[in-house]
């Protein structure tokens, strides 16, 4: 029978670490991490790490009992957890019978938004207590709410990941810019900022009709040439405060009728929000 892995939590040092080993298996040949989605009961879904590793193809694989994987996450708080994956059989060959290196994976470490993870793995038995053993590590940075997978998470939806304000902005005259956008029931307060290398105008927008989507309009006084300037719309939602997803548009000349026309180049930008 071919070896498989059985993984379980192991927070402390492995018991083998306390023992003296004359020989130890070699290091891992490769370690990779990618996010995968799994459905959860609440109708939301969770993002987990798929950690996969490749074993070195030589006879030292015969000593291999387990591989330990530890993950440290750094965002606004630090997390640390480890799993030990035991091999169910001794290795009878250095490569898979069908060809290629022995490759295994573990899916289970949860992934939070905008977090840097340090994933380390080493084979067991590992080096003796005062020796450096062979190990391998990789970094993985989880994406934020603008990611095509993450944006559908409830946390992100509440932060406006699916909201498209459809910003239009036009220069009415040398002193003013008219900004129009679609509001969202997620919040009722917004800030519109006009930038042309520096901030040339801004305005707070308060939209009392929070429960339905409406088209808001605001005329903003500017202190410089506004044509081609960037409009940045920052919403203030309860879940993310002043660090919600920001949206951008570009100021064009207003048509003669005074009605601003829609833009093609609306862009979104996360405001550095760490949920």
């Amino acid at each position: 029978r071919e070896p498989t892995v059985q993984c379980g939590s192991e927070t402390g040092p492995s018991p083998e670490w306390m023992l003296q080993h004359d020989l130890i298996p070699g290091d891992l040949r490769d370690l990779r991490v990618e996010p995968v989605t799994t459905s959860v009961a609440t109708g939301d879904y969770s993002i987990l790490m798929n950690v996969s590793w490749v074993l070195r193809a030589d006879a030292s694989i015969r000593l291999l009992k387990a591989t330990k994987i530890c993950v440290t996450g750094k965002s606004n708080f630090q997390s640390y957890s480890c799993v030990r994956c035991n091999y169910t059989e001794a290795f009878q060959t250095q490569t898979r019978p069908s060809g290629g290196k022995w490759t295994f994976s573990y899916i289970g470490f949860p992934v939070e938004l905008n977090t840097v993870y340090f994933i380390g793995a080493h084979n067991i038995p590992n080096a003796n207590m005062n020796e450096d053993g062979p190990s391998m590590s990789v970094n993985f940075t989880s994406p934020g709410c603008l990611d095509h997978i993450m944006k559908y998470k409830k946390k992100c939806v509440k932060a406006g990941s699916l909201w498209d304000p459809n910003i239009t902005a036009c220069k009415k005259n040398e002193e003013t810019v008219e900004v129009n956008f679609t509001t969202t029931p997620l919040g009722n307060r917004y800030m519109a900022l006009i930038q042309h290398s520096t901030i040339i105008g801004f305005s707070q927008v308060f939209e009392p009709h929070q429960k339905k989507q409406t088209r808001a309009s605001v005329v903003i006084p500017v202190t410089g040439d506004s044509e081609g300037a960037t409009v940045q719309l920052t919403p203030y939602f309860p879940t993310c405060g002043s660090d919600c997803i920001r949206h951008k548009g570009t100021v064009v000349l207003c048509p003669q009728t005074g009605v601003p026309f829609p833009l093609d180049n609306n862009k979104s930008k996360p405001g550095g929000w760490l949920p």
């Epitope: 004359d22 020989l23 070699g26 193809a57 030589d58 006879a59 030292s60 015969r62 000593l63 009878q92 060959t93 250095q94 490569t95 898979r96 019978p97 069908s98 060809g99 290629g100 290196k101």
Partner: antibody
Framework: EVQLVQSGAEVKKPGASVKVSCKTS????????MNWVRQAPGQGLEWIGR????????QYNQKFKDKAILTVDTSISTAYMELSRLRSDDTAVYYC???????????WGQGTLVTVSS | DIQMTQSPASLSVSVGETVTITCRAS??????LAWYQQKKGKSPQLLVY???NLADGVPSRFSGSGSGTQYSLKINSLQSEDFGSYYC?????????FGGGTNLEIK
């Protein structure tokens, strides 16, 4: 029946290169590492390196790192070893040898004599 | 790199005798050892792998033993076809190395 058939003897001048082939049959080529071993006249055996035909991972004996290049063509189940900047002390019989479950050499080619002479 | 020291370098014996060839590794190779026989002008042939396992078609008069750093190959009741060179090889971790060889000749 597992067979490893190597290309014929070669005579080369110093500084030249030579490419030795090892055509395999009778087993799944990508399932076993292929090793190359050298035996100078009247001398013992020296491991040159090995290649995994599955993904072309190569491991060399440091001594031969700048001398030998190992490649495979999985479409024709053939391994190759190219020797460059030949010198007279590269004169030897070169063998391909297929690994077993681990790196004991279960099957050997018939050997290719490479003679380097001016 | 692991050095393999083989002894004796040559041996002159008669048919029917028993011989033992030894191989010492410079460090523990955890029983990852093979023995080969090579006849003049021919390719080496696997005799024994994993210290004690005989390769297909190898007569039972050949036997291997040892562990750690010390290994040996024993040939009982030598036959005429057993004469030639014998090599040990470790396959613990690359780079793999062979012993210097033992030349077995007829007395």
């Amino acid at each position: 029946e597992v067979q490893l058939v190597q290309s014929g003897a070669e005579v080369k001048k110093p500084g030249a290169s030579v490419k030795v082939s090892c055509k395999t049959s009778g087993y799944t080529f990508i399932s076993y590492w292929m090793n190359w071993v050298r035996q100078a006249p009247g001398q013992g055996l020296e491991w040159i390196g090995r290649i995994d035909p599955y993904d072309s991972e190569i491991q060399y004996n440091q001594k031969f790192k700048d001398k030998a290049i190992l490649t495979v063509d999985t479409s024709i189940s053939t391994a190759y070893m190219e020797l460059s900047r030949l010198r007279s002390d590269d004169t030897a019989v070169y063998y391909c040898a297929r690994s077993g479950g681990f790196d004991w050499f279960a099957y050997w080619g018939q050997g290719t004599l490479v003679t380097v002479s001016s | 790199d692991i050095q393999m020291t083989q002894s004796p370098a040559s041996l002159s014996v008669s048919v029917g005798e028993t011989v033992t060839i030894t191989c010492r590794a410079s460090e523990n190779i955890n029983s990852n050892l093979a023995w080969y026989q090579q006849k003049k002008g021919k390719s080496p042939q696997l005799l024994v792998y994993d210290v004690t396992n005989l390769a297909d078609g190898v007569p039972s008069r050949f036997s291997g033993s040892g562990s750690g750093t010390q290994y040996s190959l024993k040939i009982n009741s030598l036959q005429s076809e057993d004469f030639g060179s014998y090599y040990c090889q470790h396959f613990w971790r690359p780079p793999y190395t062979f012993g210097g060889g033992t030349n077995l000749e007829i007395k």
